[in-house]
């Protein structure tokens, strides 16, 4: 049967994928055929084969990066060490051992889930120059971040949320395979309006809330958060 | 244990269509190319047609080409050989047999027992 | 596609004998060869693979030798239940392809 486990990583980071027999197990590296593939496209990640040390079947995104221990492949342990974790990388992994003295029977077959996540940059939070009388349009931009967020807009006075349908959301993805999001807030204007931007990681099950208040003038843009890093008081960075 | 079965042979005429069903037990079956070969009475060893894990890469012999289609339902572990417009000279065994997992260079072939399609009228 | 070609056709000999049958690949195939053994009305039974590997369950009388195009199966003292036909397969990529077959009669 199938063991099937679960791993998260961070976009950069090294990672490993478990794929062991119970301790005490010993193999013969010249009797084992391992396989690590991608479950659904069947991409070749690695590969052990007796008196064969060419790995030209492993796909170019993975070649260099995916590496299993000979060591502990004696030892019974099948893992893959995979390095600098790409977004790419959100798959489901297959490890198939098989011993040729068996028959070429299936002795360990695991299938890992790797989740991938990145940080979002603490939102930027800005407002035209020129709003209307009766309507201000806030922006909400944050940047780099995995997988794709959720963005709230709050009313810091109650910590309700907006109404979504004030707001408009543009998701990219860029060229580093990360998400990049805009969300144009349209909120009719009323006094000392006090309004956050919050962006929602779900994989890290982190938020990342900019705070952005308004007086009555119009021209009141030192209230606006052009740079919440450098505001300390206006940026909260929560996790639950 | 590792096993394959075939069914869906028979007696058939001249322009007939047979599809042949073949299920795999005893191994992860996604992750394997798969094949039909065949042999007729008193002949070698002859490819058919093979198929790739994702079933999105096909391959087959000159012979069958336009006549014959293979295909997989790896949810089911199954291999299949549609077969139309069939000819005397398609009369063979037909074995399913498990490939290896790459592109070249590793599993020997694992076979079936076999199933015979017969052409007559 | 790696064309495979086997010799003898056919041959026969004695129980006792050492027999030797080669196979030929018209292309370098490394050692990704396999010998199969047929008997009728059955399937082919796998006796080596990676060109000299042996078959778990196979007797050591039968070996393997050869890599890139030329390889030989040797059947060191033939026995009664030998006789039957052999075929090579190279397995290096696909579509994988088989030798003609050597059939072994007995004399």
């Known amino acids: 049967d199938t063991q099937e486990k679960e791993v998260r990583a961070m976009v950069g980071s090294d990672v490993e994928l478990s794929c062991a027999c119970p301790e005490g197990s010993r193999f013969d590296l010249n009797d084992v055929y391992v396989y690590w593939q991608t479950s659904e496209s069947k991409t070749v990640v690695t590969y052990h084969i007796p008196q064969n040390s060419s790995l030209d079947n492993v796909d170019s995104h993975y070649r260099n990066r995916a590496l299993m221990s000979p060591a502990g492949m004696q030892r019974g342990d099948f893992s893959l060490r995979l390095f600098n974790v790409t977004p790419q990388d959100e798959q489901k992994f297959h490890c198939l051992v098989l011993s040729q003295s068996l028959g070429f029977q299936e002795v360990l077959s695991v299938v890992v889930t790797l989740h991938v996540a990145a940080n979002f940059s603490v939102p930027v939070v800005s407002i035209p120059h020129n709003p209307s009388q009766d309507e201000l349009t806030f922006t909400c931009t944050s940047i780099n971040g995995y997988p794709r967020p959720n963005v709230y807009w709050i009313n810091k006075t109650d910590n309700s949320l907006l109404d979504q349908a004030l707001q408009n959301d543009t998701v990219f993805l860029n060229t580093r395979g990360l998400y990049d999001v805009v969300s144009v807030l349209r909120i009719a204007r009323t006094p000392s309006l006090n309004i956050g931007c919050c962006i929602e990681n779900v994989l890290l099950r982190q938020n990342l809330t900019v705070g952005s208040q308004t007086g009555n003038s119009i021209g009141e843009r030192d209230k606006i958060t052009e740079n919440p890093v450098s505001t300390r008081e206006k940026t909260e960075v929560t996790w639950s | 244990e590792v096993q394959l079965v075939e069914s869906g042979g028979g007696l058939v005429q001249p322009g007939g269509s047979l599809r042949l069903s073949c299920a795999g037990s005893?191994?992860?079956?996604?992750?394997?190319?798969m094949s039909w070969v065949r042999q007729a009475p008193g002949k070698g060893l002859e490819w058919v047609a093979y198929i790739k894990q994702d079933g999105n890469e096909k391959y087959y012999v000159d012979s069958v080409k336009g006549r014959f289609t293979i295909s997989r339902d790896n949810a089911k572990k199954s291999l299949y050989l549609q077969m139309n417009s069939l000819r005397a000279e398609d009369t063979a065994v037909y074995y399913c047999?498990?490939?290896?997992?790459?592109?070249?260079?590793?599993?020997?072939?694992?076979w079936g027992q076999g199933i015979l399609v017969t052409v007559s009228s | 596609d790696i064309q495979m070609t086997q010799s003898p056709s056919s041959l026969s000999a004695s129980v006792g004998d050492r027999v030797t049958i080669t196979c030929r690949a018209s292309?370098?195939?490394?050692?990704?060869l396999a010998w199969y053994q047929q008997k009728p009305e059955k399937a082919p039974k796998s006796l080596i693979y990676a060109a000299s590997s042996l078959q778990s369950g196979v007797p050591s009388r039968f070996s393997g030798s050869g890599s890139g195009t030329d390889f030989t199966l040797t059947i060191s003292s033939l026995q009664p239940e030998d006789f039957a036909t052999y075929y090579c397969q190279q397995y290096d990529s696909y579509p994988r392809t088989f030798g003609q077959g050597t059939k072994v009669e007995i004399k």
């Open positions: 005893g191994f992860t079956f996604s992750s394997y190319w």
């Open positions: 292309q370098g195939i490394s050692n990704w």
């Open positions: 047999a498990r490939e290896g997992i790459l592109w070249f260079g590793d599993l020997p072939t694992f």
